[in-house]
């Protein structure tokens, strides 16, 4: 039994890191393998992650971690019984994929303005709380070409757009994702989408 693709890990910079790897043949990850991990820290202890299958030869492990700080470094040991298959390390701050924003809501009762709000996925004491920026994707269910992205580069988790920038009388969906420039993170997954019916009063034409 050998590792074909070494484990690569990504952290949510809060409490979970996800490691994926591939074996050289079909493997029952949960019964045959164990990923041991430990924070390099005086007060830490070793933890064991039981991997799940991710395709025939692929394995994935979800590591529960202490709250992350930038200096953290974890040792990783992949075992098959008594055999050490791979040994490595992982710095969560260097491989961050933020959590997806939540609670996306479209407020349509503000005088021909659409107000989209969502929740920051981090608690205020987390470093990323004040460092996330967002991308909002709005698209029409009726017209695949009517697809737009709004970059929200300020900290407030909200976006205002004029209802008139979208077509009236049809349904739209929106979703939002996040990233943090400070740690050069990847984008988060998209939030669940929310749907609304766009309608606004057309201004009277002046003759």
């Amino acid at each position: 039994m050998k590792v074909l693709q070494e484990p690569t890990c990504v952290s949510d910079y809060m409490s979970i890191s996800t490691c994926e790897w591939k074996m050289n043949g079909p493997t029952n990850c949960s019964t045959e393998l164990r990923l041991l991990y430990q924070l390099v820290f005086l007060l830490s202890e070793a933890h064991t992650c039981i991997p799940e299958n991710n395709g025939g030869a692929g394995c994935v492990c979800h590591l529960l971690m202490d709250d992350v700080v930038s200096a953290d470094n974890y040792t990783l040991d992949l075992w098959a019984g008594q055999q050490l298959l791979w040994k490595g390390s992982f710095k969560p701050s260097e491989h961050v994929k933020p959590r997806a924003p939540g609670n996306l809501t479209v407020h349509t009762n503000v005088s021909d303005t659409l107000l989209l709000t969502w929740s920051n996925p981090y608690p205020p004491d987390n470093y990323l709380y004040n460092h996330l920026t967002y991308a909002v994707n709005i698209w029409s269910e009726n017209d695949p070409a009517d697809f737009r992205i709004y970059n929200v580069t300020y900290l407030e988790p909200s976006l205002r757009i004029a209802a008139s920038t979208l077509k009236s009388g049809i349904s739209y969906r929106a979703r939002v994702r996040a990233w943090a420039q400070c740690y050069n993170t990847t984008w988060s997954e998209w939030s669940p989408s929310t749907k609304w019916h766009n309608s606004y009063r057309e201004p009277f034409e002046q003759h």
């Epitope: 390099v40 971690m65 930038s70 200096a71």
Partner: antibody, heavy 115, light 109 residues
Framework: EVQLVESGGGLVQPGGSLRLSCAAS????????MFWVRQAPGKGLEWVSG???????SYADSVKGRFTISRDNAKNSLYLQMNSLRAEDMAVYYC?????????WGQGTLVTVSS | EIVLTQSPGTLSLSPGERATLSCRAS???????LAWYQQKPGQAPRLLIY???SRATGIPDRFSGSGSGTDFTLTISRLEPEDFAVYYC??????????FGQGTKVEIK
């Protein structure tokens, strides 16, 4: 908002015992190492003890064998049991949250050791 | 045990002046594990700098940290009235644990 509130300080005679508590709120207590740092009157800061998320502990040489740190994750609380207290243990005791350094501190509780 | 020695013990300066505080370690310290704190009378310490040079949340940019190995520096570019306080450096070591310097008092001249 992160809050750390110490209690349990007071006047104790040399050789006596005292138990300090720290009530934590505003963060996930169970995922954080916690510490006690003290400051004698007019003196500098001294790290006393720390406890990891899994219960691993460490102590300064000056308190080893006399002080015991513990935590109750269900109660979001940190404790310091201090036995065989000496005059040199007299200080303000701070509860702190952190790891390699301490971003969050309580306001401290004063322990006075005097006969 | 790693010993941190801060100098000078007291620094007498006027508002608007530049303050340079030194912290010397008895053996090499990882920059990732070197921090600076400010403490005012009757208050808990406040983290200013971590990782030798990163400012903590909410700390003004007049505070900066530098250094590596055994020599570290905290610089306050222009002293404001609220900056007069005692400053401590602190290190963490995987075997020796946590130690603080004895402090530098920055007082009004």
């Amino acid at each position: 908002e992160v809050q750390l509130v110490e209690s349990g300080g007071g006047l104790v005679q040399p050789g006596g015992s005292l138990r300090l508590s720290c009530a934590a709120s505003g963060f996930t207590f169970s995922r954080n190492a916690m510490f006690w740092v003290r400051q004698a009157p007019g003196k500098g800061l001294e790290w006393v003890s720390g406890i990891g998320t899994g219960g691993a502990t460490s102590y300064a040489d000056s308190v080893k064998g006399r002080f015991t740190i513990s935590r109750d994750n269900a109660k979001n609380s940190l404790y310091l049991q201090m036995n065989s207290l000496r005059a040199e243990d007299m200080a303000v005791y701070y509860c702190a949250r952190g790891r390699y350094y301490f971003p969050w501190w309580g306001q401290g509780t004063l322990v006075t050791v005097s006969s | 045990e790693i010993v941190l020695t801060q100098s000078p013990g007291t620094l007498s300066l006027s508002p608007g002046e530049r303050a340079t505080l030194s912290c010397r370690a008895s053996q090499s310290v990882s920059s990732s594990y070197l921090a600076w704190y400010q403490q005012k009378p009757g208050q808990a310490p406040r983290l200013l700098i971590y990782g030798a040079s990163s400012r903590a949340t909410g700390i003004p940019d007049r505070f900066s940290g530098s250094g590596s190995g055994t020599d570290f520096t905290l610089t306050i570019s222009r002293l404001e009235p609220e900056d007069f306080a005692v400053y401590y450096c602190q290190q963490y070591d995987h075997s020796a644990g946590w130690t603080f310097g004895q402090g530098t008092k920055v007082e009004i001249k």
